[in-house]
Interface confidence: low
């Protein structure tokens, strides 16, 4: 039975040239963490796996930066970065967990960045 | 329980330069990752520079070719070396690594002349 619940930073939004952090947290569950993979849309950004460590796609690599804890943090952002992310976390024995946060990335200085650096 | 701390902070003159250190205690394993925010008087927390394990680096575009991020795998410590420093890069600069609560206390770096 999966009991945990995924919290995430939600609808997020940020300047062109900026950038953000994707952050998602796992709680309410035992379950043992095995591997996180960040998506965006149907594309893999990142793995961030309990023992091999992190990969990031090179695709992404200028641009994607690991962290702070197991998210995410997007540089230089452009238009067409708006869309949806999701973080998926593997675990066991529960399975998967995932998580939906939303970036719109904005032309004008009047974003506001929802993003919590702290991490939960 | 992993602990981070900072040091190496300071007053230093625009156009300065300053080395921050972080050495991480608690690990079982060497991290995959360290990186380093800041955050000023008044605004939010900043990302500024993480570098992996194997050695790749990235950079905020505001620090990019002045600071330079790199890491001590074996002492599980990971520096900041800034050079050319601004006034605006006054802050509090944090270091963290991978985890859901790893953050330091936090070491102040003032650029004033």
């Known amino acids: 039975m999966m009991t945990g619940t995924i919290e995430t930073t939600g609808n997020i939004s940020a300047e062109k040239g900026g950038s953000i952090i994707l952050q998602c947290h796992l709680s309410s569950t035992t379950a043992q963490v095995t591997q996180v993979n960040w998506e965006q849309q149907d594309q893999l950004l990142a793995i961030c796996n309990a023992d091999l460590g992190w990969h990031i796609s090179p695709s992404f690599k200028d641009r994607v930066a690991p962290g702070p804890g197991l998210g995410l943090t997007l540089q230089s952002l452009t238009v067409n970065d708006t869309g949806e992310y999701f973080c998926i976390y593997h675990t066991y024995p529960d399975g998967t967990y995932t998580g939906r946060i939303f970036l719109e990335v904005l032309e004008s200085s009047v974003a506001e960045h929802g993003a919590r650096f702290q991490i939960p | 329980e992993v602990q981070l701390v900072e040091s190496g902070g300071g007053l230093v003159q625009p156009g300065g330069s300053l080395r921050l250190s972080c050495a991480a205690s608690g690990f079982t394993f060497s991290p995959s990752w360290m990186g380093w925010f800041r955050q000023a008087p008044g605004k939010e927390r900043e990302w500024v520079a993480s570098?992996?394990?194997?050695?790749?680096?990235w950079y905020a575009d505001s620090v990019k070719g002045r600071f330079t991020i790199s890491a001590d795998n074996s002492k599980n410590t990971a520096y900041l070396q800034m050079n050319s420093l601004k006034p605006e890069d006054t802050a509090v600069y944090y270091c963290t690594t991978e985890g859901f609560d790893p953050w330091g206390q936090g070491t102040l770096v003032t650029v004033s002349s």
């Open positions: 570098v992996l394990r194997g050695g790749y680096t």
